[in-house]
Interface confidence: low
């Protein structure tokens, strides 16, 4: 399978773009929008009936460095009642973002973008198959 | 995660905080297949909070498509196939980091940007005010 | 596709531990949960233990404080140490876990899979 590249040739490229080198790209780590804040509903991984955890992952060489990561806390979906009904399934819903790596080759650093599947939440779906009869 | 020793006869000029602008690989690093949330899982009708996915298309960006959950009910879907009021559908939101073209139309100059993306909803008791 | 094989069961003394292991094998990617249900004869199924890939853990009432439950994440195995086994312990015990594999070229983010069950007998 082929690594996506994210350049595209169907660009016209203007008189003001910056040099790159062939095979690179520049990329400015400002973020834009790094001020904004999300505005979920409160304490939803506990109220729902698919609850989740969270996880944070840490890694110096990675930007940004802290990644979090939901992890769900039943198989099944809570009731009504407060209890794990596992005829339902709580199931995890992912998502992609980009991040840099920086690599150490010798005594040179480089940058390489990466996707990184998140997951984000949990939903209670019904399921599709059970196995025990 | 762990952070690669250096060889000790390298000069000692490494800043820990990440430089403003670099240069990267032209190539994206990654195990994950970029999918179509469509195809690659049914939850979205599956779910008692179900929802609907919306394409959103920028030229700009990388990745220039990016699918939106927008949740199909207020309530949630009961055992009988019907919409329970008594329980709130609610999106799950994420921030994300994609590529903006900057300058515009550059090919191989971007920006970092965060964004807001509604991934998928969830079911959830609903917070109940009551007023005095 | 994904088999999940228990072993581990049998008949044991009231008082006295057991250890059940479960190992999930097939096109794997990641497991998010995975853990132990119990069913007793004439009685609804219900949750033993479970773990999630990052350690997180949780246990039925009946079982707090004398059972205990880990994984290998490395080994797809989680292992559940039951002390202190009483009467009321006895059911088939199913092993369940919640993971992401690859089929036929398609990735499913997350399903929930069952083993066939291992036989716990405990007599007094």
């Known amino acids: 399978r082929k690594i996506p590249k994210v350049g595209h040739t169907f660009f016209q490229k203007p008189e003001s773009c910056p040099p790159v080198p062939g095979g690179s790209m520049k990329l400015d780590i400002g973020i834009i929008n790094e001020n904004q804040r999300v505005s979920m509903s409160r304490n939803i991984e506990s109220r729902s009936t698919s609850p989740w955890n969270y996880t944070v992952t840490w890694d110096p060489n990675r930007y940004p460095s802290e990644v979090v990561q939901a992890q769900c806390r039943n198989l099944g979906c809570i009731n009504a009642q407060g209890k794990e009904d596992i005829s339902m399934n709580s199931v995890p819903i992912q998502q992609e973002t980009l991040v840099v790596r920086r690599k150490h080759q010798g005594c040179s650093v480089s940058f390489q973008l990466e996707k990184v599947l998140v997951t984000v939440g949990c939903t209670c779906v019904t399921p599709v198959i059970h196995h025990v009869q | 995660g762990i952070t690669i020793p250096r060889n000790p006869g390298c000069p000692n000029s490494e800043d820990k905080n990440f430089p403003r602008t670099v240069m990267v690989n032209l190539n994206i690093h990654n195990r994950n297949t970029n999918t179509n949330p469509k195809r690659s899982s049914d939850y979205y009708n599956r779910s008692t909070s179900p929802w609907n996915l919306h394409r959103n298309e920028d030229p700009e960006r990388y990745p220039s498509v990016i699918w939106e959950a927008k949740c199909r009910h207020l309530g949630c879907i009961n055992a009988d196939g019907n919409v329970d009021y008594h329980m709130n559908s609610v999106p799950i939101q994420q921030e994300i980091l994609v590529l903006r073209r900057e300058p515009p139309h550059c090919p191989n100059s971007f920006r970092l940007e965060k964004i807001l993306v509604s991934v998928g909803c969830t079911c959830v008791t609903p917070i109940v005010h009551h007023v005095a | 596709e994904v088999q999940l094989v228990e072993s581990g069961g049998g008949l044991v003394q009231a008082g006295g531990s057991q250890s059940l292991s479960c190992v999930a094998s097939g096109t794997i990617v990641n497991i998010n949960v995975m853990g132990w249900y119990r069913q007793a004869p004439g009685k609804q199924r219900e949750l033993v233990a479970l773990i999630t890939s990052g350690g997180g853990t949780t246990y039925g009432d009946s079982v707090k404080g004398r059972f205990t439950i880990s994984i290998d994440n490395a080994k797809n195995t989680v292992i559940l140490q039951m002390n202190s086994l009483e009467a009321e312990d006895t059911a088939v015990y199913y092993c369940?876990?919640?993971?992401?594999?690859?089929?036929?070229?398609?990735?499913?983010?997350?399903?929930?899979?069952w083993g066939q069950g291992t036989q716990v007998t405990v007599s007094s």
């Open positions: 369940a876990a919640e993971i992401g594999y690859y089929s036929g070229g398609t990735y499913f983010s997350s399903e929930a899979h």
